[in-house]
């Protein structure tokens, strides 16, 4: 906190410029008018102040705007954005995508900070939904952004925004999140032809139900093992050996290397050993010949 002292004669700042780096902290406090600072915030971003001097400038803005900064100031905060607390940011009303981009640029290359998370939350809530432009921007800065949202938050993503999603944006998503995103992706890409559709839908398939996997198996898609291993176990279990063979195409040989891992392990346990043998991969653990398989879940449903 800088003591309140009168500004020395001739030192009153008429504009925000480089000469202010020669001001002591108390002189900045006494000689820089907060309203002038607010209107010329863009200039602050071109002046090599020390962190201590920036603290004084932030203090002046805080005094001028106790209820929260206007967007005209927020857009030009630059480094000062990193000095804001989430409580400060919750007072803001940020509506411009340009403002959001400018602030995300300051934090570029760093992990998503509490300030950034709060800013994004305020921005998205203000817009009412995650539109395509916003999603484009956020995933460009933070590829993992989408997977940081809860399934409830993801439900506000319109299908049209799914076009902005890149495969790497989904790397850290869990099955609950993909369950929400997959139907939106299916809707977004529904008018594409077979091979193009598969390329687009592939990274969302961790949320696909059995019937969609069965349908894909009829389309010669040649799903790779990495994608197969991310499928929902409950969606894979009902697939027949023939369907999995068609789904994977030439990649079916990779099942052998994954036979101890889910969902392959659990799927093998559900298949007749005879059928598994037809693949010629030496997969073991299927149901021996002559055994009858009872679907107990069906029996419970009937009783």
């Amino acid at each position: 906190e800088v003591e309140k002292t009168a500004c020395p004669s001739g030192k009153k700042a008429r504009e925000i410029d480089e000469s202010l780096i020669f001001y002591k902290k108390w002189e900045l406090e006494a000689c820089v008018d907060a309203a002038l600072l607010a209107t010329q915030m863009d200039r602050v971003n071109a002046i090599p102040f020390t962190y201590e001097q920036l603290d004084v400038l932030k203090h002046k803005l805080d005094e001028l705007y106790p209820q929260g900064y206007p967007e005209s100031v927020i857009q030009h905060l630059g480094y000062l954005f990193l000095k804001m607390s989430p409580e400060d940011i919750r007072k803001w009303n940020v509506t411009s995508l340009e403002t959001l981009k400018a602030l995300l640029e300051v934090n570029k290359g760093h992990e998503m900070s509490p300030q950034v998370a709060t800013l994004i939350d305020r921005f998205v809530k203000g817009r009412g939904q995650l539109d395509k432009d916003t999603l484009d921007t956020l995933t460009a800065f933070y590829p993992g952004y989408l997977c940081s949202l809860s399934p409830e938050e993801l439900s506000s993503v319109p299908p049209s925004s799914i076009w902005a999603v890149r495969p790497q944006d989904l790397d850290t998503c869990d099955p609950r999140q993909l369950d929400v995103l997959y139907p939106k992706a299916r809707l977004a890409f529904q008018n594409m032809n077979g091979s193009e559709y598969f390329v687009k839908i592939q990274s969302f398939l961790g949320g696909a139900p059995t019937e969609d996997l069965k349908a894909l198996s009829q389309q010669n898609v040649s799903m790779d093992l990495a994608t197969f291993m991310k499928l929902r176990t409950d969606a894979v279990l009902p697939l027949t050996v023939a369907e999995v063979q068609k789904l994977l195409g030439p990649h079916v040989e990779g099942l052998k290397a994954e036979e101890r891992h889910r969902p392959v392990r659990d799927w093998i346990l559900r298949q007749r050993q005879d059928d598994l043998d037809t693949l010629g991969l030496g997969l073991q653990g299927g149901i021996p010949n002559g055994y009858l398989v009872l679907d107990l879940s069906m029996q419970e449903a009937l009783s």
Epitope: A46, I47, F49, L77, G78, Y79, A102, E105
Partner: nanobody
């Protein structure tokens, strides 16, 4: 936070000269405006000089005008502070601070200058 690295400090006799350097660690300084600051023992840090990202604009504190010269070599990604006619009152730790695109900031840990 982005780091700057100062070097070139040392012990010098009154009337002598030193050239301080400011370089970036892990990024390039070329589009950064740079300010030189100093802090004497028990005193507040004060501005000494500044130079724009292009090198076209320079500024100096009254106490060093005519004695200190700030310059930059963008090919070497370095900013210099040439200090001539040094006085005992120039004894301090000298720091550089920078501001780049979007108001990104960087600052160094300082290099010590003793005039005695």
């Amino acid at each position: 936070q982005l780091q700057l690295v100062e070097s070139g400090g040392g012990l010098v006799q009154p009337g002598g000269s030193l050239r301080l350097s400011c370089a970036a660690s892990g990024f390039t300084l070329d589009n950064y405006a740079i300010g030189w600051f100093r802090q004497a023992p028990g005193k507040e840090r004060e501005g000494v000089s500044s130079i724009s990202s292009s090198g076209g604009s320079t500024n100096y504190a009254d106490s060093v005008k005519g004695r200190f010269t700030v310059s930059r070599d963008n090919a070497k990604h370095t900013v210099y502070l040439q200090m001539n006619s040094l006085k005992p009152e120039d004894t301090a730790v000298y720091y550089c601070a920078g501001v780049g695109d979007y108001g990104r900031r960087a600052m160094g840990q300082g290099t010590s200058v003793t005039v005695s």
